[in-house]
Amino acid sequence: QPSVSPGEPSPPSIHPGKSDLIVRVGDEIRLLCTDPGFVKWTFEILDETNENKQNEWITEKAEATNTGKYTCTNKHGLSNSIYVFVRDPAKLFLVDRSLYGKEDNDTLVRCPLTDPEVTNYSLKGCQGKPLPKDLRFIPDPKAGIMIKSVKRAYHRLCLHCSVDQEGKSVLSEKFILKVRPAFKAVPVVSVSKASYLLREGEEFTVTCTIKDVSSSVYSTWKRENSQTKLQEKYNSWHHGDFNYERQATLTISSARVNDSGVFMCYANNTFGSANVTTTLEVVDKG
């Protein structure tokens, strides 16, 4: 337990005085926080948080879902924690099945254990399929299993968390990994026509096609040397995974001579930007 010099605020003291505690399902959890400036206990697991203003946290009949981190905080904002595992042979994993990974980043499969004393806490492919050869993971019984450096090829990968028990694999509920692609190139932009010659009063309509790996690509029509917001309409499609197309159509229903000029379709993503232009020349009716 923490100890500091007198006069200096110190963190609360927790009994039992250990960082981890393992209890059996149905047993009592009894945690005592000793501090003259006690404020609260906080319990955290996955996305769940509970608070308790009593300095003794008592759970009479522990369940697997009482597994988690119990933190005592004092009036100085100092805290101390104990992690409690509630061993339940019928519920080895707590799960949050949402699983999104950004390409090239690590992502956490949230399947913390209710009992850390297990063998081969791992990821397994669904229906006995092997995991991708290059997939690497880091297990943490209190948090789950971290997939290292998510690849685009892992999109829609079906996974289970797994442990070995008496020679057999025990699997968690299944997870489906959804990969958000990283931008590794600028958007591809093209325009329906490079130049237009119209008579005054005719309709001007031009379409810019923007292609990228995801819909979070930004695009806009701009008139060169002008801040005026142009009216544009969008259509978009996902042609399978990581193949997004947007069509941005700029329309001037009745073109005037002073509408003549260069119009730019501009698109950007986190990698960079691209643009393409079209020229409009409007002549009077004469």
Partner: nanobody, 128 residues
């Protein structure tokens, strides 16, 4: 820097037992996952067993499951590999390994690319 020194290897008859030890010196032993790899004659180095820093969560290769047991004593900065029902195919140099962030691959196999520190190895020979 972490130094790993293995001991306990030797010659044993098939069906016999050996207990390997690996003592770590240097940084905080309790923060590291520890494990054992082995390299048989003319073979590539392969994973045998591992134990996470919590001292409770363990990993075994299929070839040693049910026969080998890994354990650690953080007070003694030591990791052990108890090897029972030894077979001639267990003959190998056994290397102790430490990693702050161990990475595993399919089948719960510790990827040796994520090992931070290696021991020099201890020879185990199982005669038939």
């Amino acid at each position: 820097q972490v130094q790993l020194v293995e001991s306990g290897g030797g010659l044993v008859q098939a069906g016999g037992s050996l207990r390997l030890s690996c003592v770590a010196s240097g940084r905080t032993f309790s923060s590291y996952a520890m494990g054992w790899f082995r390299q048989g004659p003319g073979k590539e180095r392969e994973f045998a067993a591992a134990i996470l820093s919590n001292g409770l969560t363990t990993y075994y290769a299929d070839s040693v499951k049910g026969r080998f047991t890994i354990s650690r004593d953080n007070a003694k900065d030591t990791v052990y590999l108890q090897m029972n029902s030894l077979k001639p195919e267990d003959t190998a140099n056994y290397y102790c390994a430490a990693a702050f962030t161990p990475e595993f691959r399919d089948g719960g196999i510790w990827d040796d690319a994520s090992v931070d520190y290696w021991g020099q190895g201890t020879q185990v020979t199982v005669s038939s």
